[in-house]
Interface confidence: low
């Protein structure tokens, strides 16, 4: 099977993760969206939107908030008060069935570490934002996957922008391609 290239981001405990996932609104405006984490080889759905989606009607599951803007093809994910145990691989997906999802982006490997006292960025109000935009599908022997384009690392205490080009990826079996824990 083909493995997705994951991108690694480091956060301190207490920080908030903000992720924006664009999707093709013509295809997926009325679809449910989900935020998933890999546990072993199996994706675990942590939160999913209702159907039909309503603009700016947030779905909250614990520390995770999903806000779908179907008129604009935008899913916003927020994970607050990050903990060490949140480390892993995450993805935005179009949720169609527990065993069939359209994965929108390369997985992001989240690494949450304990912040030493006085370390900038260790407070709950410190947030790093990740922009995720649909990826161009690349031909592979296994399931279609994306290759990363640009990762811009801003200075400490700043923010991170991740962007990948093109249009959404269609993956029929998420378990074939995602190996490690995920985060967005």
């Amino acid at each position: 099977t083909t493995e997705l290239t994951e991108e690694k981001y480091e956060y301190k405990e207490g920080q908030t993760l903000e992720v924006k996932c664009d999707y093709a609104l013509e295809k997926y405006a009325n679809s449910r969206k989900a935020w998933q984490k890999m546990e072993g080889k199996m994706p675990k759905i942590l939160a999913k939107t209702e159907r039909p989606s309503e603009n700016s009607h947030p779905v909250q599951v614990g520390r995770i908030t999903l806000e779908d803007y179907p008129d604009h093809g935008l899913l916003q994910v927020r994970m607050t008060n990050l903990q060490v145990e949140d480390s892993g691989l995450y993805q935005c997906v179009i949720y169609q069935h527990p065993k069939e999802s359209h994965v929108l982006f390369n997985p992001i490997c989240l690494v949450v570490t304990k912040g030493s006292s006085g370390t900038p960025g260790s407070s709950e109000n410190s947030t790093q934002n990740v922009y995720r935009t649909p990826s161009t599908t690349a031909k592979a022997l296994g399931p279609r996957y994306t290759s990363p384009r640009t990762v811009t690392q801003a200075p400490p205490e700043s923010t991170v922008v991740v962007s990948t080009p093109g249009s959404e990826i269609n993956l029929t079996n998420v378990t074939d391609i995602i190996r490690v824990p995920v985060f967005n």
């Epitope: 700016s56 927020r78 109000n125 962007s163």
Partner: antibody, heavy 116, light 105 residues
Framework: QVQLVQSGAEVKKPGASVKMSCKAS????????INWVRQAPGQGLEWIGE????????FYAQKFQGRATLTADTSTSTAYMEVSSLRSEDTAVYYC?????????WGQGTLVTVSS | DIQLTQSPSSLSASVGDRVTITCSAS?????MHWYQQKPGKAPKLLLY???NLASGVPSRFSGSGSGTDYTLTISSLQPEDFATYYC????????FGQGTKLEIK
């Protein structure tokens, strides 16, 4: 209807700071991102940064990191931007905008003039 | 940052003309948004996510494109369309094109 109403024009000396406001109405303030964009006289549009009023989290253009500060008061549905260490090239109209995938509503703008 | 280059920078046209403005990105972006600005006014959203008309925008405006090349088309110019047009991308740090000024011939 959705409205973003910005504070009035400001004249500042080089090195000073300016704080402007953007009062939102007609929608749930915490559901949308507020962006700030500026436009120097006769020039194009330049993105400064954004704030999520619900969480207070911010994201800045690298050029403005450390010099612009975005805040939001959810009790009054008002977003604020403070720009410090003003220089003459900061003379511009500053707009607040509401963002989803694009900036669908804009304030009328606040003209900031920096002159000695 | 992704640079956006609009072409042409200025354009003279007549009422009823079909006008095309292009926006070229320095690297691939997912979508392009377009704004219209008239002198002394705030910009107004015309098209979002490449081809979707914003609320209240006439159907003579249309957008297309993908990757690095995007187009805004006005099928039949009306007097109120003379303005400056900006493209805008959000596939990373947000950037705008330098603007295209559409003037009456």
């Amino acid at each position: 209807q959705v409205q973003l109403v910005q504070s009035g024009a400001e004249v500042k000396k080089p090195g000073a700071s300016v704080k402007m406001s953007c009062k939102a109405s007609g929608y749930t303030f915490t559901d949308y991102v507020i962006n700030w964009v500026r436009q120097a006289p006769g020039q194009g549009l330049e993105w400064i940064g954004e704030i999520y009023p619900g969480s207070g989290s911010t994201f800045y253009a690298q050029k403005f990191q450390g010099r612009a500060t975005l805040t939001a008061d959810t009790s009054t549905s008002t977003a604020y931007m403070e720009v410090s260490s003003l220089r003459s090239e900061d003379t511009a109209v500053y707009y607040c905008t509401r963002r989803m995938a694009a900036m669908d509503y804009w304030g009328q703008g606040t003209l900031v003039t920096v002159s000695s | 940052d992704i640079q956006l280059t609009q072409s042409p920078s200025s354009l003279s046209a007549s009422v009823g003309d079909r006008v095309t403005i292009t926006c070229s990105a320095s690297s691939s972006v997912s979508y392009m948004h377009w704004y219209q600005q008239k002198p002394g006014k705030a910009p107004k959203l015309l098209l979002y996510t490449t081809s979707n008309l914003a609320s209240g925008v006439p159907s003579r405006f249309s957008g297309s494109g993908s990757g690095t090349d995007y187009t805004l088309t006005i099928s039949s110019l009306q007097p109120e369309d003379f303005a400056t047009y900006y493209c805008h991308q959000w596939s990373g740090y947000p950037t705008f094109g330098q603007g295209t000024k559409l003037e009456i011939k």
